[in-house]
């Protein structure tokens, strides 16, 4: 069962309750005690699993990816799982921990020595919601820019948002992914009505910035469903 799979990853020995955010089972590695996260909350003591459901990697932390916790698990159940370290098996880049990428089914280091000059890399994009499979469109993409440890600036090729500088996210652009600006108040955003529809965009937008959400623009409420304009608005 899901419970038994996840209970084996229980986060133990956390600091005493302080009314804050808590770890979850996707992470086999216990969080370091006493670390403060953005927002200033510490974890709550919980000696059992806390699955964090997701549909895409962007909903998980930088050290996680979104997948079904069991091979033949419930179709609708995907949770954030701990990223795979170097030399571990993978099916896509997001499965590998930051500083690594998925090459020939193995997580390998993406330090600058591996990326000198122009390299050819397989980027497997999953266009459905089941990120734990290799179904979807797989294509070879040339990463023509050098990738260094410095965070990617706007327009830089990226694999995940953590590759990009602050204020940028990693979003699809044609058939590769580049760092694009996180959306500001009033900017047009994309509201995904249909499950998995984010995979169909070839010009993907970033998400709205802190304190903003993607909502129908007030003066567009009367418009037909297809022409409703969504913008980033204050909560």
């Amino acid at each position: 069962t899901l419970n038994s799979v996840l209970n084996s990853n229980a986060i133990k020995n956390l600091p005493p309750p302080l009314g804050g955010a808590a770890g979850h089972p996707g992470s086999a590695v216990s969080a370091a005690p006493g670390i403060l996260y953005p927002g200033g909350n510490k974890y709550q003591t919980i000696d059992n699993y806390q699955p964090y459901p997701c549909a895409e990697d962007e909903e998980c932390g930088t050290d996680e990816y979104c997948a079904s916790p069991t091979r033949g698990g419930d179709a609708g159940v995907q949770i954030c799982l701990a990223c795979r370290k170097r030399r571990k098996r993978c099916m896509r880049h997001a499965m590998c921990c930051p500083g690594n990428y998925c090459k020939n089914g193995i997580c390998v280091s993406s330090d600058q020595n591996h990326f000198r000059g122009e390299i050819e890399e397989t980027i497997t994009e999953s266009f459905g919601n089941d990120h734990s499979t290799l179904d979807g469109y797989s294509r070879r993409t040339t990463l023509s820019s050098k990738m260094y440890h410095t965070k990617g600036q706007e327009g830089s090729v990226c694999l995940r948002s953590s590759d990009c500088a602050s204020g940028l996210c990693c979003a699809r652009h044609f058939w590769s992914k580049i760092c694009k600006p996180v959306l500001k108040e009033g900017q047009v955003c994309t509201k995904h009505r249909r499950k998995g529809s984010h995979g169909l965009e070839i010009f993907q937008r970033c998400y709205c910035g802190e304190g903003l959400s993607c909502r129908i623009q007030k003066d567009h409420h009367q418009a037909s469903n297809s022409s409703r304009l969504h913008t980033c608005q204050r909560h």
């Epitope: 997701c54 609708g76 995907q78 998995g196 998400y207």
Partner: nanobody
């Protein structure tokens, strides 16, 4: 910091139903995962159910599968837990939990922030 206020708890007979609500407000309501946890007297807090931001992925504890349904209304910044066929062993303080938004907000791991809880008592 997100403030979470649970409501809808109370006394119910075995086999009965309750609907818990959780209103989120404060610094941000991120519209990411929302969850429910519970803590029975003398026991550890345990996971009950959670739903992701789009509602496309839900996960339940085995003990509540088929009886409880989690849902969320992002436009109202509210999460719900519909509890049917309640049993005495469901008696607990139920806590709403809001996801932190994961990597979009700079977190290395997706985590929950907690409400104060609402008591649910199942007894005849």
């Amino acid at each position: 910091e997100v403030q979470l206020v649970e409501s809808g708890g109370g006394l119910v007979q075995p086999g009965g139903s309750l609907r818990l609500s959780c209103a989120a407000s404060g610094h941000t309501f991120r519209g990411y995962a929302m969850g429910w946890f519970r803590q029975a007297p003398g026991k550890e807090r345990e996971f009950v159910a959670a739903i992701n931001r789009s509602g496309s992925s839900t996960v339940y504890a085995d003990s509540v599968k088929g009886r409880f349904t989690i849902s969320a209304d992002n436009s109202k910044n509210t999460a719900y837990l519909q509890m049917n066929s309640l049993k005495p062993e469901d008696t607990a303080v139920y806590y709403c939990a809001a996801g932190n938004g994961g990597r979009a907000y700079g977190y290395s791991r997706a985590r929950y922030e907690w409400g104060q809880g609402t008591l649910v008592t199942v007894s005849s």
